[in-house]
């Protein structure tokens, strides 16, 4: 759909005569008839297939035609068409003399024709006017013409319909070729799809208007890229919704059981070393000079047994003093007055030089001890059995009878309760002083993680159209994360797509 526009500019008829040569009385009151039709190699009479238009009397004999388009007048002349512009045309322009006021063809004498011109050719749609001038023996007509598209029609042939809109059916303006140009923030074939906030997660986020990012169930954050952990999850994270994966040092269904008391509470004082030994349980290894559960008590300096070779320690205001046994001297009784050459070892002990002869050490036979093998051994006096084991003297040797849960020569080894993998369903086992503890994965509880605490609501595949299913552990229900184009609690309804031409 478009308009053929013809702008008459000047008509010259100096002698004021008709085509027959007869003069007009008193002058040629001139009006024009225009016929637009399909292309003909030789323009012939016949129907004006593209349309006709007539003007009122525009002047007498010779005159210039005023441009009346701004004032709602009839110049340029409009010849609308409701078809694809073919690119070629034929045009006939007749100038007539009007003796009276009735300009209808049947009301005029046949010899009222002043002049007739006929042209044909090709014409592309465009804003530019083509200027032409036709001259006969008695007259001259200067005019210009063009073809433009009607409102909302575009393209080389005015065949593409495009009407800008900003509503539910689309958000666009039209390009010169008739293609849609989406308004900022919209995309898609008909510019119906909003462009979400930059970075908004493709699957976990969506939007109903531009620069928005609304999260699907189980997701949060400005870009919907953070999963929501299980309700009540204390010291844990998630990689998919409703999970509770415990941070290091935490256990339990809600990651609220402290397995790393040392790091979280730093209970050991005075530079002591802390070791975790179960839930909310720890052991402090004190530095010399300190004691107490948390190494909070300062020891007497002698409590660290600084005196060597059987020296006895005496506390003093400014420290301590070692009273050395006979044969030893030095701050810690670390030096000997004798060497192996003096045969210092008793009871058949063998002497070994140390520090290039500055010291010696006695290697005692069984049943003897002391720096110089001077003491007979009671093998149980040193309480060699650990963890409450009972020491039994057996002649030259001794034996430890261990309490349940301990083993080894000195009952020093803890029999691991975890060795037999007692925790079910992938639970983590922790050896404690008086037994064991299982840290259960999400969905299981009980002393050995044997109780399933939640039903997998996703097991029955309740979500349609390839939606992702998540189990909400707090309610034992499922949540469907719909792909683009589907809605509903099970993603069962397709979003209504627009018709091919929504206008």
């Amino acid at each position: 759909s478009g308009v053929f526009q013809l702008q008459l500019q000047e008509f010259i008829n100096e002698r004021g005569v008709l085509a027959s040569g007869r003069p007009c009385e008193p002058g040629c009151r001139t009006f024009f008839r225009v016929c637009l039709k399909h292309f003909q190699a030789v323009v012939s009479p016949g129907p004006c297939t593209f349309g006709t238009v007539s003007t009122p009397v525009l002047g007498t004999n010779s005159f210039a035609v005023r441009d009346d388009s701004s004032g709602g007048g009839r110049n340029p002349l409009q010849l609308p068409f409701n078809f694809t512009w073919p690119g070629t045309f034929s045009l006939i322009i007749e100038a007539w003399h009007a003796p009276g006021d009735d300009l209808r063809p049947e009301a005029l004498p046949p010899d009222a024709l002043i002049s007739k011109i006929a042209i044909q050719g090709s014409l592309a749609v465009g804003q530019n006017w083509l200027l032409d001038e036709q001259t006969s023996t008695l007259t001259r007509l200067r005019y210009s013409y063009r073809v433009i598209c009607s409102d909302n029609y575009y393209g080389d042939n005015c065949s593409r319909l495009c009407k800008k809109r900003n509503d539910h059916f689309g958000h666009y303006v039209c390009q010169p070729d008739g293609n849609l140009s989406c308004l900022p923030g919209w995309t898609g074939e008909y510019c119906q799809q909003p462009i979400c906030l930059s970075g908004c997660h493709e699957q976990n986020g969506y939007c109903s208007k531009p620069a928005e990012c609304l999260c699907r169930p189980g997701w949060q954050g400005r870009l919907c890229n953070e999963c929501i952990p299980h309700n009540g999850c204390r010291h844990g994270t998630c990689s998919t919704p409703w999970q509770c994966t415990c941070d290091e040092g935490w256990g339990g269904l809600f990651c609220d059981q402290d397995l790393n008391y040392c790091t979280h509470h730093s209970p050991c004082k005075n530079g002591a070393t802390c070791s975790n030994s179960g839930q909310r349980s720890y052991t402090c290894t004190c530095r010399p000079g300190y004691t107490g559960v948390d190494c909070e008590l300062e020891l007497s300096e002698c409590d660290s047994n600084p005196c060597r070779n059987g020296g006895s320690c005496k506390d003093q205001e400014d420290g301590y003093h070692c009273l050395c046994p006979p044969g030893y001297y030095g701050l810690h009784c670390e030096h000997s007055t004798l060497s192996c050459a003096d045969s210092p070892c008793f009871n058949g002990g063998s002497c070994r030089e140390r520090n290039q002869g500055a010291n010696y050490a006695c290697e005692c036979p069984p049943n003897f001890t002391g720096s110089n093998c001077e003491k007979k051994v009671d093998r149980c006096t040193s309480n060699p059995c650990a963890n409450g084991g009972q020491c039994l003297n057996r002649g030259p040797s001794r034996m430890c009878r261990c309490r349940p849960g301990f083993t080894g020569t000195y009952c020093e080894l803890h029999v691991s309760d975890c060795a037999r993998n007692p925790c079910a369903h992938g639970g983590t086992c922790h050896d404690l002083e008086n037994g064991l503890m299982c840290t259960c994965p999400a969905g299981f509880s009980g002393r050995r993680c044997e109780v399933r605490t939640s039903i997998d609501a996703c097991a029955s595949s309740p979500c349609f159209n390839r939606a992702t299913c998540y189990t909400d552990l707090s309610t034992d229900t499922f949540v469907c994360n719909c792909p683009y184009g589907f809605v509903g609690s099970r993603c069962e309804f397709p979003v209504g797509l627009p018709p091919s031409f929504p206008w």
């Epitope: 046994p325 006979p326 044969g327 007055t337 004798l338 060497s339 050459a341 003096d342 002869g357 110089n372």
Partner: nanobody, 119 residues
Framework: EVQLVESGGGLVQAGGSLRLSCAAS????????MGWYRQAPGKQRELVAT??????TRYADSAKGRFTISRDNAKTVSLQMDNLKPEDTGVYYC??????????????WGQGTQVTVSS
């Protein structure tokens, strides 16, 4: 029981010399070593020098290079002290390291002799 008698102490100028002697008497068991300890005022008794039957000698760091210990025989010991300093002042005790009837080592001590070094 062993008795130890010291001699040779006295007052001396800094840089001077003294010679201490000690003799053991009485029911003498096996003596393995003899030597000298010093007790400065307000301080603990500390070893100065010792020599064993096998001629093993030990010196305190402060005595090295200035003092010389020697065993004249099994029952006597001497300490030659040269280039004396004020910090060498104190009571010098002779001692002997000996065995008893029950096999172990025992220290026997003398009464002590005063050494005073003036500056």
């Amino acid at each position: 029981e062993v008795q130890l008698v010291e001699s040779g102490g006295g007052l001396v100028q800094a840089g001077g010399s003294l010679r201490l002697s000690c003799a053991a008497s009485g029911d003498i068991p096996r003596i393995a070593a003899m030597g000298w300890y010093r007790q400065a005022p307000g301080k603990q008794r500390e070893l100065v020098a010792t020599v064993s039957n096998a001629a093993t000698t030990r010196y305190a760091d402060s005595a090295k290079g200035r003092f010389t210990i020697s065993r004249d025989n099994a029952k006597t010991v001497s300490l030659q002290m040269d280039n004396l300093k004020p910090e060498d002042t104190g009571v010098y005790y002779c001692y002997s390291l000996a065995t008893t009837v029950t096999p172990s080592w025992v220290n026997y001590w003398g009464q002590g002799t005063q050494v005073t070094v003036s500056s």
